[in-house]
């Protein structure tokens, strides 16, 4: 009697549906009364499967409504173990454990990534500095080295900094900045850049005419805006008030004059 | 050194319920198999199930209507329950360990007589 | 189930005498993984619980003195004292682990003479 496995690693992605496999010797019906199938992970109970019942009280929680032996499998000789929505968690090595008539079992080893695919932009710029700041943020796991390019994929130098957090589902979030001197329409790449092939993702930041956001030291430059503004508006309203005031002084004074007098009088004043 | 010790009632009434215990020293439950055997006044051995390290069971099929195998890590124990109860289930009862799924029992209790009588 | 059978049910010896008692299986117990036989010896003494002598069919357990030799196959298994001493006097019984439920022989006595 020998189990056997199609493959002995699979690589999964996180969020997504994998089902495993084990091979075993069934000779025309299966008969369920002598077959037990254990699945494990580690030290945590998947599957029981014992005489045609599978004995949920003795999973362990982190399987719980997520994992399942697909019994249509059973009597072709495969005892395949679906687990769905895939964690962080699911990563390891797990036992299938076979018992008809004699007895085997077999180890496959689970790894499981998660693509920094969805890459968070941002661009501010200080105007103090003219210097730009361009932000890449995205999720995923393992590990990523942020990589950051200009329009000839050349790399770009600049002030960078890189912090790293845990989100709830252990996924690793990942924040990359880079402040460089740019002009509009400059184009540049971050890389989400990981060793194994196809799991580097790249955004394309494009440096806009006017800056897409305003750092918190702009709010400085728009109270300062404001108060010249206001001044102006105190300004004339003061000086038309004078205005008015000075026209009637000039009617108390002289009285009714000529009209040639009473325009270039008008006229000065308006051009006052 | 792993060392096993049964306790428990050594006199049964018919149609009651046999409850064992097994307190294990020198290991924990992280690893292994932890078993059940017998052995019958005509010197029959029988296995009766386990408990795994990860909380698997497996009862033989002969019992398997009457058997339950629980443990409590905490206490280090491991317990036999055996329902409905016979004079066919006096025995000396053992507690064993094997050392994975399809190995032998290396360590084995001191063992427990049960007679089961009214 | 796989039936164990063992050979004879009492054996008389003398001390310093070589003895040998049989097992056998109702199916193979050749595990494909390893290429070795899922069968072991054990020995109860009166009063005592059984204790591992034998696995794989002819690896000793540690502490087993040399004397004791498992040996066979498939399906027919021998367990051989080259010198029997006084102490050996105890019940043998062998046992698959091959597939589930594990199954014992009836035992072998061994008894003086």
């Known amino acids: 009697f020998t189990v056997t496995v199609p493959k002995d690693l699979y690589v999964v992605e996180y969020g997504s549906n994998m089902t495993i496999e084990c091979k075993f010797p069934v000779e025309k019906q299966l008969d369920l009364a002598a077959l037990i199938v254990y699945w494990e992970m580690e030290d945590k109970n998947i599957i029981q499967f014992v005489h045609g019942e599978e004995d949920l009280k003795v999973q362990h929680s982190s399987y719980r409504q997520r994992a399942r032996l697909l019994k249509d499998q059973l009597s072709l000789g495969n005892a395949a173990l679906q687990i769905t929505d895939v964690k962080l968690q699911d990563a390891g090595v797990y036992r299938c454990m076979i018992s008809y008539g004699g007895a085997d079992y077999k180890r496959i080893t689970v790894k499981v990534n998660a693509p920094y695919r969805k890459i968070n932009q941002r661009i501010s710029v200080d105007p103090a500095t003219s210097e730009h700041e361009l932000i890449c943020q995205a999720e995923g796991y393992p590990e990523a080295e942020v990589i950051w390019t200009n329009s000839d994929h050349q790399p770009v130098s600049g002030k960078r900094s890189v912090t790293t957090s845990r989100t709830e589902g252990m996924l690793l979030n990942v924040t990359s900045s880079l402040r460089v001197n740019a002009t509009a329409n400059d184009v540049f790449y971050c890389t989400f850049w990981r060793s194994q092939p196809g799991q580097n993702h790249t955004a394309e930041l494009i440096i806009p005419e006017l800056p897409a956001t305003h750092p918190p030291q702009n709010r400085t430059h728009w109270v300062l805006l404001g108060s010249i503004l206001l001044f102006l508006i105190v300004v004339s309203t003061v000086l038309l008030f004078l205005r008015k005031q000075v026209r009637m002084l000039d009617v108390e004074k002289c009285g009714v004059e000529d009209t040639s007098s009473k325009n270039r009088n008008d006229t000065q004043f308006e051009e006052t | 050194e792993v060392q096993l010790r049964e306790s428990g009632p050594s006199l049964v009434r018919p149609s009651q319920t046999l409850s064992l215990t097994c307190s294990v020293t020198?290991?924990?439950?992280?690893?292994?198999?932890w078993n059940w055997i017998r052995k019958f006044p005509g010197n029959e051995l029988e296995s009766m199930g386990y408990?795994?390290?990860?909380?698997?069971?497996y009862y033989n099929p002969s019992l398997k209507s009457r058997i339950s195998i629980t443990r409590d890590t905490s206490k280090s124990q491991f317990y036999l329950q055996l329902s409905s109860v016979t004079a066919e289930d006096t025995a000396t009862y053992y507690c064993?360990?094997?050392?994975?799924?399809?190995?032998?029992?290396?360590?084995w209790g001191q063992g427990t007589l049960v007679t089961v009588s009214a | 189930d796989i039936v164990m059978s063992q050979s004879p049910s009492s054996l008389p010896v003398s001390v310093g005498e070589k003895v040998t008692m049989s097992c056998k299986s109702s199916?193979?117990?050749?595990?494909?993984?390893?290429?070795?036989?899922?069968l072991a010896w054990y020995q109860q003494k009166p009063g005592q619980s059984p204790k591992l002598l034998i696995y794989?069919?002819?690896t000793r357990e540690s502490g087993v003195p040399d004397r004791f030799t498992g040996s066979g196959s498939g399906t027919d298994f021998t367990l051989t004292i080259s010198s029997v001493q006084a102490e050996d006097l105890s019940v043998y019984y062998c046992?698959?682990?091959?597939?589930?439920?594990?199954?014992f022989g009836s035992g072998t006595k061994l008894e003086i003479k």
């Open positions: 064993a360990r094997s050392e994975g799924w399809l190995l032998p029992f290396a360590y």
């Open positions: 020198g290991d924990s439950f992280t690893s292994g198999y």
């Open positions: 408990i795994s390290y990860s909380g698997s069971t």
């Open positions: 199916q193979s117990l050749l595990y494909s993984s390893n290429q070795k036989n899922s």
């Open positions: 794989w069919a002819s």
């Open positions: 046992q698959q682990y091959y597939g589930y439920p594990f199954t």
